[in-house]
């Protein structure tokens, strides 16, 4: 039961995280105009990965897409790439994890296959989360660098008469959405990997244990202890063989393929 819960929760957390990564990638407010010097501005600028926008006090908002690829900063391109890779990996991870869910039965899929799929999706979620966190962090670092550079050149006097106020940008909402979403996807991935350990089929546990025969010999079939007796009446003895990794009721809730002969 705990494994199902861990896997299910990991899936849900990752799903929320990936939705957040998609939202962050699409959001226009990656960087917003710093209002420290002018809190009541009549023209408010903000920028995303795909377009920059201006919101006037009149309520009129104008957005212009970045219609060039080569003219854009390499860092911005890198951030775009990281976010897209994160989304793609996350989407594939979600697809894989749906089939890996313990609560969903697809034909006669073995536990080992489900365990492998859970691990695969978990790794994908971890990498997806890391991509998002990296992308957002690279953009944030770029902002910090530009912020202090523009602060140094904040006012350039033209003959001491005309002031040219340089627009400074600070962290936008998308950065925080991205960080949180990346973190959630990462956590979801870790949960899936943890769930994978619990999903590993029983025979793998047996191989790891050295057995010492005591008087009578028992023939161990690939299906495990239950398969040798033909029914699950010997579950009380199970803890001897799997190192106490699972409780009795967990064994009953995860039937192997040999239970349906």
């Amino acid at each position: 039961m705990a494994v199902t819960a861990c896997q299910g929760l990991g899936f849900v957390v990752s799903l929320i995280g990936i939705a957040g990564i998609i939202a962050a990638t699409c959001m226009d407010q990656w960087s917003t105009q710093d209002l420290y010097n002018n809190p009541v501005t009549a023209v408010f600028n903000y920028q995303g990965l795909w377009r920059s926008c201006v919101r006037e006090s009149s309520g009129f908002t104008e957005c212009r897409g970045y219609f060039t690829l080569l003219g854009l900063p390499a860092m911005l391109q890198a951030v775009r790439a990281l976010m897209i890779v994160g989304i793609v990996l996350g989407a594939i991870g979600l697809l894989v994890s749906i089939f890996a869910l313990k609560c969903i039965r697809i034909g006669s899929m073995e536990d080992s296959a489900k365990a492998n799929m859970t691990l695969t999706s978990g790794i994908m979620f971890i990498v997806s989360g890391l991509c998002a966190i990296a992308g957002v962090s690279v953009f944030a670092n770029m902002l910090v660098t530009n912020f202090w550079m523009s602060t140094a050149n904040m006012y350039t006097g033209m003959g001491g008469m005309v002031q040219t106020v340089q627009t400074r940008y600070t962290f936008g909402a998308a950065l925080f959405v991205g960080w949180v979403a990346g973190g959630l996807t990462l956590i979801g991935g870790v949960m899936m990997c943890i769930a994978c350990r619990g999903l590993a089929p029983e025979e793998t546990n047996y191989k790891a244990v050295s057995y010492h025969a005591s008087g009578h010999s028992v023939a161990y079939k690939p299906g495990g202890f239950k398969a040798s007796t033909g029914f699950g009446s010997n579950t009380k003895n199970k803890k001897i063989y799997d190192g106490g990794a699972r409780t009795e009721d967990e064994v009953q809730s995860y039937p192997s393929k040999h239970d349906y002969v």
């Epitope: 009549a42 600028n45 201006v54 009149s58 309520g59 627009t167």
Partner: antibody
Framework: QIQLVQSGPELKKPGETVKISCKAS????????MNWVRQAPGKGLKWMGW????????TYAEDFKGRFVFSLETSAATAYLQITNLKSEDTSTYFC???????????WGQGTSVIVSS | DIVMTQSPSSLTVTTGEKVTMSCKSS????????????LTWYQQKPGQSPKLLIY???TRESGVPYRFTGSGSGTDFTLTISSVQTDDLAIYYC?????????FGSGTKLEIK
């Protein structure tokens, strides 16, 4: 078409209060900011401030903080300018104007003349 | 506050003549985000309310005759009337729409001979 109709001229004594109305028609008042502009006799235009359409929050220019109050009555599609403790230097024509694209004042009321005299 | 300086304070011209008036701002009115200059021109005829002529320094408001042209960028702006008509007798004001408080120039009075 869009129209801003202001209340009639006012003759007041110093220390009194005046409330000028500006009724909007042809558009939704709550979609656009309302600005107030003062023009003293024979002088230029002076921006007094504006009131945000969605929140109804007023912003006042430095010279108009204190005795001047902007308000909105959305149900009546009317904006108001109230001046308390009138002084002779408040004698002016007061205009309401809609804030539009480009932060421009695209539609103006006909103006309300306020004369403060003892 | 941004200070708007208009020159000349008054102009006397004959009909059909080309006229230009200047407006200078103490701060840059060019917004880097959309590369637009937040400068507006208004026309106020005697006894009337001001009327919007040009916004974003060079965009003509609908219904405004083609003889009115706005130009300039940053801090220096110009309003040009290519062929003055008697109907153009008015005071012309420029306005900063870039930052609060919005400020107007002192105006240029156009008189017809």
């Amino acid at each position: 078409q869009i129209q801003l109709v202001q209340s009639g001229p006012e003759l007041k004594k110093p220390g009194e209060t005046v409330k000028i109305s500006c009724k909007a028609s042809g558009y939704t008042l709550t979609n656009y900011g309302m600005n107030w502009v003062r023009q003293a006799p024979g002088k230029g235009l002076k921006w007094m401030g504006w009131i945000r359409p969605n929140t109804g929050e007023p912003t006042y220019a430095e010279d108009f903080k204190g005795r001047f109050v902007f308000s909105l009555e959305t149900s009546a599609a009317t904006a108001y300018l109230q001046i308390t403790n009138l002084k002779s230097e408040d004698t002016s024509t007061y205009f309401c104007a809609r804030l539009y694209r480009g932060n421009t004042l695209d539609n103006w009321g006909q103006g309300t003349s306020v004369i403060v005299s003892s | 506050d941004i200070v708007m300086t208009q020159s000349p304070s008054s102009l006397t011209v004959t009909t059909g003549e080309k006229v230009t008036m200047s407006c200078k701002s103490s701060q840059n009115l060019l917004n880097s985000g959309n590369q637009r200059n937040y400068l507006t021109w208004y026309q106020q005829k005697p006894g009337q309310s001001p009327k919007l002529l040009i916004y974003w320094a060079s965009t003509r408001e609908s219904g405004v005759p083609y003889r009115f042209t706005g130009s300039g960028s940053g801090t220096d702006f110009t309003l040009t009337i290519s062929s003055v008509q008697t109907d153009d007798l008015a005071i012309y004001y420029c306005q900063n729409g870039y930052s609060f408080p919005f400020t107007f120039g002192s105006g240029t009075k156009l008189e017809i001979k």
